[in-house]
């Protein structure tokens, strides 16, 4: 028969042959050959491959270095990497995330639109017209000003996006 | 500082019960396995088994099953080795200690001597 | 059960020597871990995945091997070298170590 040019999936071609891939949590020790299936070998401790493969040796898994501000969300197995995470209050770099970074404060005149995760950073947007922010925050919205009518107070200094309006008492020498 | 800090040492007669704590600092206990190996007096090291202390899953040299119980307390990032129906083979020095990652190549602790003996 | 038997059991060597040892497993492993260990002291990983130094480790040890032999090479012997080595396997439970080998001062 003709030799094949191409394999099935979770095949791979070598000396004119298809030989079963590696399944994940394991390497590949030796090519099928026409009388011998393909020889696999499971990945040991610390070790992982993720993918049908031809690898001849695992990776090794990713270590979650607390020095840059990283933890362990999932410990890896013979199937998959560790997956790290950011500490309390910081947020990966990258996709990857191989470090991490202190969650942005919103500034006076913006609030939080977003609180910031392990993967994603804070998203401030400013405080929209009847709306405040007068700290440095990494949780706090845009809170709206006081309605002084419904505390049958009157506005004596109006609001910005940076302050709360300041309510006063009603003049009483109106008719 | 990382440590594994293990209790101090225990003199049992024989078909008594020892427990062993393996106190962790410095990193999260659940984000290894905790490995107990024993080591007799000029001999070599033996592997009796290991917890994933975020499940409580072990996995425990045949040597030993039966005889040996592994623990862990996440809330206070300590774990346990317990071995039952002691005998004058298992005078040794038992160590605890962790898988490692490339960054961190395992940690051990300072190691527990138990004496059995009548 | 994989038994790992490690060949010599000690041996004597003088300080600049090549010193070999090796680590035989009964069926494909892996890898292999290198461990010393000085007297009444607990053992530190010394070579991981093989052929990996651990951190703090001269570039005078070296490690190499696949399937069923490993081996361990000083290349050049130093006084703080003298100890006992172990590999372990940590592919099959139950992991296994080889019976040690101690290295002494000729």
């Known amino acids: 028969p003709e030799p094949p040019t191409a394999c099935r999936e979770k095949q791979y071609l070598i000396n004119s042959q298809c030989c079963s891939l590696c399944q994940p949590g394991q390497k590949l020790v030796s090519d099928c050959t026409e009388f011998t299936e393909t020889e696999c070998l499971p990945c040991g401790e610390s070790e992982f491959l993720d993918t049908w493969n031809r690898e001849t040796h695992c990776h090794q898994h990713k270590y979650c270095d607390p020095n840059l501000g990283l933890r362990v969300q999932q410990k890896g197995t013979s199937e998959t990497d560790t997956i790290c995470t950011c500490e309390e209050g910081w947020h990966c770099t990258s996709e990857a995330c191989e470090s991490c970074v202190l969650h942005r404060s919103c500034s006076p005149g913006f609030g939080v639109k977003q609180i910031a995760t392990g993967v994603s950073d804070t998203i401030c947007e400013p405080c929209p017209v009847g709306f405040f922010s007068n700290v440095s925050s990494a949780f706090e919205k845009c809170h709206p000003w006081t309605s002084c009518e419904t505390k049958d107070l009157v506005v004596q200094q109006a609001g910005t996006n940076k302050t709360d309006v300041v309510c006063g008492p009603q003049d009483r020498l109106r008719a | 500082e990382v440590q594994l800090v293990q209790s101090g040492a225990e003199v049992k007669k024989p078909g008594a019960t020892v427990k062993i704590s393996c106190k962790v600092s410095g990193f999260n206990i659940k984000d290894y396995y905790i490995h107990w190996v024993k080591q007799r007096p000029g001999k070599g090291l033996e592997w009796m088994g290991r917890?994933?202390?975020?499940?409580?899953?072990?996995k425990y040299d045949p040597k030993f099953q039966g005889r040996v119980t592994m623990t862990a307390d996440t809330s206070t990032d300590t774990a346990y080795m317990e071995l039952s129906s002691l005998r004058s083979e298992d005078t040794a020095v038992y160590y605890c200690?962790?898988?490692?990652?490339?960054?961190?190549?395992?940690?051990w602790g300072q190691g527990t001597t138990v004496t059995v003996s009548s | 059960q994989i038994q790992m038997t490690q060949s010599p059991s000690s041996l004597s060597a003088s300080v600049g020597d090549r010193v070999t040892i090796t680590c035989s497993a009964t069926?494909?492993?892996?890898?292999i871990l290198w461990f010393q260990q000085k007297p009444g002291k607990a053992p530190k990983l010394w070579i991981y995945?093989?052929?990996n130094l651990a951190s703090g480790v001269p570039a005078r040890f070296s490690g190499s091997g696949s399937g069923t032999d490993f081996t361990l090479t000083i290349s050049s012997l130093q006084p703080e070298d003298f100890a006992t080595y172990y590999c372990q396997q940590r592919t099959f439970y139950p992991y296994t170590f080889g019976g040690g080998t101690k290295v002494e001062i000729k």
């Open positions: 200690t962790t898988s490692y990652y490339v960054g961190t190549y395992g940690y």
């Open positions: 917890i994933d202390p975020e499940d409580g899953d072990t």
């Open positions: 069926s494909s492993v892996s890898y």
């Open positions: 995945s093989t052929s």
